[in-house]
C-alpha cells in the first residue's frame, strides 16, 4: 500500500517517499521506484538553507554600496549573505535593505547608547549637574566642572548646554 506520510527529510510524490535534497543543493529530478532523488549543488552566488525539494536556488542578497550597505558575512551555498551598514550609518530595518546616517544628539542631550550597524544613536537629556554643548553621535553628557576642587568659585551657573564658569574667590583685604 502506498505511503500517505513520509519520514523526516523525505517528501511524498507519486505515492513514493523521496529524500529531500540537503541544504546547499537543489532538486533536479524526483526519485522513482528504481532511482534516488537527483540533487545538485547550488551555483555560485546562490543558496538553499533547508532540506528541500526546490528546483531553483535563491540568489544571495546584494549589499548595494549605493544604499550604504557592505557585506558583513559572505553567503555560502547554505546561507544568505548578511549585509550591514558603512561606518556612521545604520540599517533601516531588520532585513537591512538600506541605511541611514546615525542621528546626532543635540546640545543639551548626550549619547546614552552609541549607534551600531543595526541600531540608531539613543540620546538622553543631560540631567542637572551635566551638560553637552555639541551636536554629536558619540559624546556623552559631561559633568559640570567642580570649581571647589580647583579652589575656585562658581561665577556662572551651568545649564544642560553649558558648563559652569569658575572664578577666583574674593580675597578679604
Amino acid at each position: 500500500e502506498p505511503p500517505t506520510a513520509c519520514r523526516e527529510k523525505q517528501y511524498l510524490i507519486n505515492s513514493q517517499c523521496c529524500s529531500l535534497c540537503q541544504p546547499g543543493q537543489k532538486l533536479v529530478s524526483d526519485c522513482t521506484e528504481f532511482t534516488e532523488t537527483e540533487c545538485l549543488p547550488c551555483g555560485e552566488s546562490e543558496f538553499l538553507d533547508t532540506w528541500n525539494r526546490e528546483t531553483h536556488c535563491h540568489q544571495h542578497k546584494y549589499c548595494d554600496p549605493n544604499l550604504g550597505l557592505r557585506v558583513q558575512q559572505k553567503g555560502t551555498s547554505e546561507t544568505d549573505t548578511i549585509c550591514t551598514c558603512e561606518e556612521g550609518w545604520h540599517c533601516t530595518s531588520e532585513a537591512c535593505e538600506s541605511c541611514v546616517l546615525h542621528r546626532s544628539c543635540s546640545p543639551g542631550f548626550g549619547v546614552k547608547q552609541i549607534a551600531t550597524g543595526v541600531s540608531d544613536t539613543i540620546c538622553e537629556p543631560c540631567p542637572v549637574g551635566f551638560f553637552s554643548n555639541v551636536s554629536s553621535a558619540f559624546e556623552k553628557c559631561h559633568p559640570w566642572t567642580s570649581c571647589e576642587t580647583k579652589d575656585l568659585v562658581v561665577q556662572q551657573a551651568g545649564t544642560n548646554k553649558t558648563d559652569v564658569v569658575c572664578g577666583p574667590q574674593d580675597r578679604l583685604r
Epitope: S19, Q22, G24, V28, S29, C31, T32, F34, T35, E36, T37, E38, C39, L40, P41, G43, E44, T76, S77
Partner: antibody
C-alpha cells in the same frame, strides 16, 4: 555490466577543435547525471563538465567555460564533449563518468581517451 | 574554489601496516567528500562516498571518517593490491575539486 567507453581522443593543434563521445551501457542512461573528468600528465584530476540526467542543467569550471560543451543523446545512450579553442593545458586523459543521483560522487568511470594539444 | 589538501604526498608502508590518509578542505563541505583509488595504468575507482559510506565491492579494511573540513581514509592492514594513488573529491560546491593525491607505495 555497467560500462562507459570513450572515443574521439586525438592529437590536435592549439586553437583546434575535437569532439569526444562516451557510449554508455548496462544501466538506464536517462536516469543519471554524467560528467567528464580529465587527468593531466602530472596525474592531477580535474573536473571538466557535468550534465544532469535530463540534460537541462550543465556546469563547467572557469578553465573551460565558453570553450567546452557537454551534451547527451538519450536515444543513443551517448555522452559528448565538444571542445574548441584548445590549449596545450587541455592535454590530458579524458574520462567519462557516471554520477550518483543523490550524491554526485563519480561511481562509474570509463577507461579514458587521450587528447594531446600540440603544434 | 574549495581547495583539498591531501597529506602526506607519499606514504611508504609494509603490507600488514595500518595507515591513515588525510584530506583537508579550505572551507566546510559538510560530508560531501569522496575517496577514489587509482592503480597504475587504470581508471580511478570510487571507494567511499559521503565521507564514510562504503561502496559495494570496497573491501571492509577501508573506512572513511570526518565532516566539515577534516577527513580521513583509513586502511586497516594494507594488502599488496592496495598500492597506488588515492584522491579525495568534493561535490559540495561548484567547481567540483580533487585533492592532488596520496601515493601509497611499498616500503
Amino acid at each position: 555490466e555497467v560500462q562507459l567507453v570513450e572515443s574521439g581522443g586525438d592529437l590536435v593543434k592549439p586553437g583546434g577543435s575535437l569532439k569526444l563521445s562516451c557510449a554508455a551501457s548496462g544501466f538506464t542512461f536517462s536516469s543519471y547525471g554524467m560528467s567528464w573528468v580529465r587527468q593531466t600528465p602530472d596525474k592531477r584530476l580535474e573536473w571538466v563538465a557535468t550534465i544532469s540526467s535530463d540534460g537541462s542543467h550543465t556546469y563547467y569550471p572557469d578553465s573551460v567555460k565558453g570553450r567546452f560543451t557537454i551534451s547527451r543523446d538519450i536515444a543513443k545512450n551517448t555522452l559528448y564533449l565538444q571542445m574548441s579553442s584548445l590549449k596545450s593545458e587541455d592535454t590530458a586523459m579524458y574520462y567519462c563518468v557516471r554520477q550518483g543521483r543523490y550524491v554526485p560522487s563519480f561511481d562509474v568511470w570509463g577507461a579514458g581517451t587521450t587528447v594531446t594539444v600540440s603544434s | 574554489d574549495i581547495v583539498l589538501t591531501q597529506s602526506p604526498a607519499t606514504l611508504s608502508v609494509t603490507p600488514g601496516d595500518s595507515v591513515s590518509l588525510s584530506c583537508r578542505a579550505s572551507q566546510s563541505i559538510r560530508n560531501n567528500l569522496h575517496w577514489y583509488q587509482q592503480k597504475s595504468h587504470e581508471s580511478p575507482r570510487l571507494l567511499i562516498k559521503d565521507a564514510s559510506q562504503s561502496i559495494s565491492g570496497t573491501p571492509s579494511r577501508f573506512s572513511g571518517s570526518g565532516s566539515g573540513t577534516d577527513f580521513t581514509l583509513s586502511i586497516n592492514s594494507v594488502e599488496t593490491e592496495d598500492f597506488g594513488m588515492y584522491f579525495c573529491h568534493q561535490t559540495n560546491n561548484w567547481p567540483f575539486t580533487f585533492g592532488s593525491g596520496t601515493k601509497l607505495e611499498i616500503k
